[in-house]
Interface confidence: low
């Protein structure tokens, strides 16, 4: 098909006359608004068909779509159609009139629709508003079609300004109809069962009166059919339930169970699936790692957590040094085992304001008639270090010694430092580290003892100072993973008559 002029969009003057020509290899015809306007059809000597549409005394109402199509499309390979859009800017025509049914837009699902308000002039600015609102809505506008987007159930009008007057369109009403779609839910009494136990599944549909259920399941594939039971839940309107019950499950019953529901009125359907696992026997399985050495800080609370999978539900016991633990009435220990999913459990032992005596060997045991698992770890109580004693003495040898004693868990490190300029120490001058050099000035001797009952280390360190010629600030710092503590003593030379 050949259209002259080709378009696809033309802007014509009001009151003018315009000729449209369409030609093709078979009879052709012009269509306007599903009608065939008066036109001149001809057949040329070369066998070409044509149709001439003469538009006279054009007005804004001539704005719109024009189609050229084959008069009789039978026998042609393609149902070809050429579209042309003509604008006739006309200040006397505001918005092009709509048929009554175009003012009411019905939809059954959330989908894009078009509010078909059109003007005669492609240069005009058109805005969309809610019927009772002044704010222009941010919806794209196509001069040939209107506003397209997703709209709520409201009334809308279009506005434009022609010359100096504001023009409103008719109101458009958008209605969303509630067609009952199928919504299926499937659940099982248990998704994990032991062989010999029952599998029971339920498939529920809401909001429909007549539906058809179809189950697919592993047993069906081997030709062993199970007859489901369908019932209505009387206390809930339009709740229909199908129950699939397989007594004495076998290992081969593991797999996917699918409930497919159809309703014939609107030809809707939905399906949901659920996985069922049939196990040979029950199990208890630890999930994740728990280090075999755990730490808690003295006087702080500590929760020790073990995550495991089990079926059937297990009994969980906690032991300390082979003695069973229970929730203490004093609130010092709290035990809890939570079911976080059908087969997953979290067991927690909470020690409130941890005491040294709570260090030891802890075991969690989860068991049922088929299986058991134990998890053990050593709990170490970390105690912040403290310097218990820092003293200075003058042995007969002439050297001066400083002794530092402290305790903590884990084993504290000891750091000796000294400062000679008392006025500027330690704010301005950093102290000098002692005991880790090969200089003869100082000598260090450190002993470490582990006190079993208190479950902590004691560090005793003696610093020997060969020669002290002026007052010296000596600092002993103890450090471990949970803290540090420092004490300071001023060492004066033998010759000075006083000590600070």
């Amino acid at each position: 098909l050949v259209v002259t002029p080709p378009g696809p969009e033309l802007v014509l003057n009001v009151s003018s006359t315009f000729v449209l020509t369409c030609s093709g290899s078979a009879p052709v015809v012009w269509e306007r608004m599903s009608q065939e306007p008066p036109q001149e059809m001809a057949k040329a000597q070369d066998g070409t068909f044509s149709s001439v549409l003469t538009l006279t005394n054009l007005t804004g109402l001539d704005t719109g779509e024009y189609f050229c199509t084959h008069n009789d499309s039978r026998g042609l390979e393609t149902d070809e159609r050429k579209r042309l859009y003509i604008f006739v800017p006309d200040p006397t025509v505001g918005f092009l009139p709509n048929d009554a049914e175009e003012l009411f837009i019905f939809l059954t699902e959330i989908t894009e629709i078009t509010i078909p308000c059109r003007v005669t002039d492609p240069q005009l600015v058109v805005t969309l508003h809610e019927k009772k609102g002044d704010v222009a809505l941010p919806v794209p506008y196509d001069h040939q079609r209107g506003f397209s987007g997703i709209f709520e159930d409201r009334s809308y009008i279009c506005k434009t300004t022609i010359g100096d007057r504001e023009v409103d369109s008719d109101a458009y009403y958008v209605y969303r109809l509630q067609v009952s779609s199928i919504n299926v839910s499937v659940n099982a009494v248990q998704t994990v069962v032991r062989q010999g136990e029952n599998i029971t599944l339920m498939c529920i549909v809401i909001g429909n009166e007549v539906v058809n259920f179809e189950w697919t399941y592993p047993r069906k594939e081997s030709g062993r059919l199970v007859e489901p039971v369908t019932d209505f839940l009387l206390d809930m309107p339009y709740h229909i339930r199908s129950i699939l019950h397989i007594p004495s499950a076998e290992l081969e019953d593991s797999g996917t169970y699918t409930c497919n529901v159809t309703e014939s009125v609107n030809d809707h359907q939905d399906e949901k699936a659920i996985n069922i696992t049939v196990v040979e026997s029950g199990y208890v399985r630890l999930l994740g790692e728990v280090g075999t050495l755990q730490f808690a800080e003295l006087h702080r609370s500590r929760t020790l957590q073990v995550v495991f999978e089990a079926y059937p539900p297990p009994t969980v016991l906690w032991f300390k040094d082979n003695r069973t633990l229970g929730d203490s009435s004093a609130g010092e220990i709290a035990l809890s085992t939570r079911n976080v999913s059908e087969t997953r459990y979290v067991s927690e032992l909470t020690l409130v304001r941890v005491k040294v005596a709570e260090a030891g060997h802890y075991t969690m045991r989860a068991f049922h008639e088929d299986a058991e698992v134990q998890l053990s770890f050593q709990l170490q109580i970390n105690v912040p270090v403290r310097v218990l004693e820092l003293s200075e003495s003058h042995p007969d040898s002439g050297e001066q010694t400083v002794r530092c004693r402290g305790r903590g868990m884990p084993q504290p490190n000891i750091i000796w430092s000294a400062c000679r300029d008392l006025k500027r120490c330690p704010r301005e001058l950093p102290p000098t580290l002692l005991g880790n050099s090969s200089e003869e000035e100082s000598q260090l001797e450190t002993n470490v003892t582990y006190w079993e009952e208190e479950q902590e280390f004691e560090v005793v360190s003696t610093l020997r100072l060969q020669h002290v010629d002026r007052p010296l600030s000596v600092r002993c710092t103890l450090r471990n993973a949970v803290g540090q503590d420092t004490q300071e003593v001023i060492v004066v030379p033998h010759s000075l008559p006083f000590k600070v």
Epitope: L286, G291, L293, Q374
Partner: antibody, heavy 125, light 103 residues
Framework: AVTLDESGGGLQTPGTALSLVCKAS????????MAWVRQAPGKGLEFVGE????????FYAPAVKGRATISRDNGQSTVRLQLNNLRAEDTAIYYC??????????????????WGHGTEVIVSS | LTQPSSVSANPGETVKITCSGS???YGWYQQKSPGSAPVTLI????QRPSNIPSRFSGSKSGSTGTLTITGVQAEDEAVYYC???????????FGAGTTLTVL
């Protein structure tokens, strides 16, 4: 990602001692047992030994018992295999391995869940 | 631990490799060439690490562990070792290895 880098392999003389070091990264080293596994030329995998996460327990294969010592430094995330009195049959690729699992009161069960690329040791005069 | 020395299969077939011993828990390891680092396929009889394809699965019946490869592929050609996980008295042990040939 878990990485295990072995070092210390090479040509060794029979009767001498071997020291292999494995540097670990990408996981909480102090929470996991570590193991050494070797593979002699043309042979299968052979467990050498394992050390518990706190270094409180070590387990050795019969072929190296009495000659092997596995130690670890949780601060540096390293594990060391010392093998004394080397023999020609100690020639192998030595793999450092991260062992996961659970220690129970009576024993440990573990499996290897990460492997190093291996370091080759040749014992020859 | 006892396992067959070799098995062969055509692409797409299912292969089962057994490992018999007295372990309560088996692991399975794949080594594609001698001297290359092994890869852990299965631990604790049937647990599969997240980076291992689902065609590898493990099971245990009685005292025998089984590694199953469903729909074998050319790249699965390798030596497969089973290992026990008991550490009560000595270090763990490995089977002698099974060579899988994909025809």
């Amino acid at each position: 990602a878990v990485t295990l880098d072995e070092s210390g392999g090479g040509l060794q003389t029979p009767g001498t001692a071997l020291s292999l070091v494995c540097k670990a990264s990408g996981f909480t080293f102090s929470s996991f047992n570590m193991a050494w596994v070797r593979q002699a030329p043309g042979k299968g995998l052979e467990f050498v030994g394992e050390i518990s996460n706190t270094a409180g327990s070590t387990f050795y294969a019969p072929a190296v018992k009495g000659r092997a010592t596995i130690s670890r430094d949780n601060g540096q995330s390293t594990v060391r295999l010392q093998l004394n009195n080397l023999r020609a049959e100690d020639t192998a690729i030595y793999y450092c391995a991260k062992a996961a699992g659970t220690c129970y009161s009576h024993s440990c069960t573990g499996y290897i869940d990460a492997w190093g690329h291996g370091t080759e040791v040749i014992v020859s005069s | 631990l006892t396992q067959p020395s070799s098995v062969s299969a055509n692409p797409g077939e299912t292969v089962k490799i057994t490992c018999s011993g007295s372990s309560s828990s088996y692991g399975w390891y794949q080594q594609k060439s001698p001297g290359s680092a092994p890869v852990t396929l299965i631990y604790e009889n049937n647990q599969r690490p997240s980076n291992i394809p689902s065609r590898f699965s493990g099971s245990k019946s009685g005292s025998t562990g089984t590694l199953t490869i469903t729909g074998v592929q050319a790249e699965d050609e390798a030596v497969y070792y089973c290992g026990n996980a008991d550490r009560s008295n000595s270090a763990g042990t490995f089977g002698a290895g099974t060579t899988l040939t994909v025809l």
